[in-house]
Amino acid sequence: GITNINCSGHIWVEPATIFKMGMNISIYCQAAIKNCQPRKLHFYKNGIKERFQITRINKTTARLWYKNFLEPHASMYCTAECPKHFQETLICGKDISSGYPPDIPDEVTCVIYEYSGNMTCTWNAGKLTYIDTKYVVHVKSLETEEEQQYLTSSYINISTDSLQGGKKYLVWVQAANALGMEESKQLQIHLDDIVIPSAAVISRAETINATVPKTIIYWDSQTTIEKVSCEMRYKATTNQTWNVKEFDTNFTYVQQSEFYLEPNIKYVFQVRCQETGKRYWQPWSSLFFHKTPETVPQVTSKAFQHDTWNSGLTVASISTGHLTSDNRGDIG
């Protein structure tokens, strides 16, 4: 960066090189050039010469003042106009940054995705800081009182093998950057309560010719968890509102859910599951599209289709459950 150049003087920033966005700042440039009494001192920001708010302080020093500085990063350097020199002489340069202190991390969440071997902890970091912000995740066993710390820039994956202090833990997050430090509330977790089943996937759909044509959605999960609750939501792509079907599932076999849908309409389906009675859901599965036939013939749709999307109707299913209407987005 600009800070690696050979200097013939000194450049510095007040109040600091990293400062709060929107502050008034002063950048000082002091020349120390052999055989040069600078006639003028010039400032450059990102290669553009600054024209305004430059004040000469003394023979060797000038100040550039910025009001309400809002740029997250800028490269500054200054030059001198020396008598008998045709070109400006470089004095020094500095990278400056502006941003915000971190907000208090909130919505700390830790989950174990089945088969991952990791506990994944996430949080809401709050507003963008614009500057380098580090997070320390503290994990303290409630049984042994042993505490471990993990440094990260965003979320953290902690190997479940390293969680040797039993099943109950306190987790909290500390956020810190050059402008401040904040700490979240403590989250109490039990490892058995935070497991999210292996992802449920819709594999195919078929519409069967019958007196009243019906569509069967086939879906499955590799989970070994016995008691799993799932939701399937669907809608015609032209609609806004999802219809949601809830059911208890045993994944010892591929699930089949029946829907009585309108002909010649494109539908979109998604599924998600959780361990029954626990807190955390899987994210909704990938969008699965199926267009119902105009009338009689059997139509099969396969998984991993990608298409434009966007809504719903009435349903029946081999699984037990009930129908609800839903405007929810993806909720954890």
Epitope: R39, K40, E50, R51, F52, I54, R56, K59, P83
Partner: antibody, heavy 119, light 107 residues
Framework: QVQLVESGGGVVQPGRSLRLSCAAS????????MSWVRQAPGKGLDLVAD??????????YYADSVKDRFTISRDNSKNTLYLQMNSLRAEDTAVYYC??????????WGQGTLVTVSS | DIQMTQSPSSLSASVGDRVTITCRAS??????LAWYQQKPGKAPKLLIY???SLQDGVPSRFSGSGSGTDYTLTISSLQPEDFATYYC?????????FGQGTKVEIK
């Protein structure tokens, strides 16, 4: 050699607008700052507006007396400087000179164009 | 903005006289000073820049000196064509500012 030719001056009523032009030749227009300096009858020289060179990203300056009324601009493809003067007042009556600066002193000047604001 | 005060505001002199015009800045301008000559109905003409550097084509009877806040334009031997108004300009800090002018008249 450097040549600056102003045009667009004339007699105008208070509150009306006028646009001055300055056609430049004989130097690298992009690399120089361009200014409008005015001289009221029998008075001294005053910098009215300035548009800087490419190295300054064409930063503009206006004297407090003309801020929000005058607009300086340049067309680098035509080597021409402009001054759009709106809401003219009697005190804007002056000879308007186009001037060139590479450093910050004015190296070359046009012959001037007279603007008279009178009802 | 930096204020420039020129003195005298006018002077009468004869051909062959040595004439001195001074310009004082409201703060140190580090030799960033130019001098201009203006004749009636004409545009100003650059004589001196950087306090003491003579612009190409300007007769050597014109010279400039000074540092800090005080600067001088000297015409060593006044010629008939030198009767005009002279202005100083500081370009140390933006925006550049002019002195109010010194009129050199025939005695």
């Amino acid at each position: 050699q450097v040549q600056l030719v102003e045009s667009g001056g004339g007699v105008v009523q208070p509150g009306r607008s006028l646009r001055l032009s300055c056609a430049a030749s004989g130097f690298d227009f992009n690399s120089y700052g361009m200014s409008w300096v005015r001289q009221a009858p029998g008075k001294g020289l005053d910098l009215v507006a300035d548009i800087n060179s490419k190295s300054y990203n064409y930063a503009t300056y206006y004297a407090d007396s003309v801020k929000d009324r005058f607009t300086i601009s340049r067309d680098n493809s035509k080597n021409t400087l402009y001054l759009q003067m709106n809401s003219l007042r009697a005190e804007d009556t002056a000879v308007y000179y186009c001037a060139v600066h590479h450093s910050d002193y004015f190296e070359y000047w046009g012959q001037g164009t007279l603007v008279t604001v009178s009802s | 903005d930096i204020q420039m005060t020129q003195s005298p505001s006018s002077l009468s002199a004869s051909v062959g006289d040595r004439v001195t015009i001074t310009c004082r800045a409201s703060q140190d301008i580090y030799t960033n000073l130019a001098w201009y000559q203006q004749k009636p109905g004409k545009a100003p003409k650059l004589l001196i820049y950087h306090a003491s550097s003579l612009q190409d084509g300007v007769p050597s009877r014109f010279s400039g000196s000074g540092s800090g806040t005080d600067y001088t334009l000297t015409i060593s031997s006044l010629q008939p064509e030198d009767f005009a108004t002279y202005y100083c300009l500081q370009d140390s800090e933006y925006p550049p500012t002019f002195g109010q002018g010194t009129k050199v008249e025939i005695k």
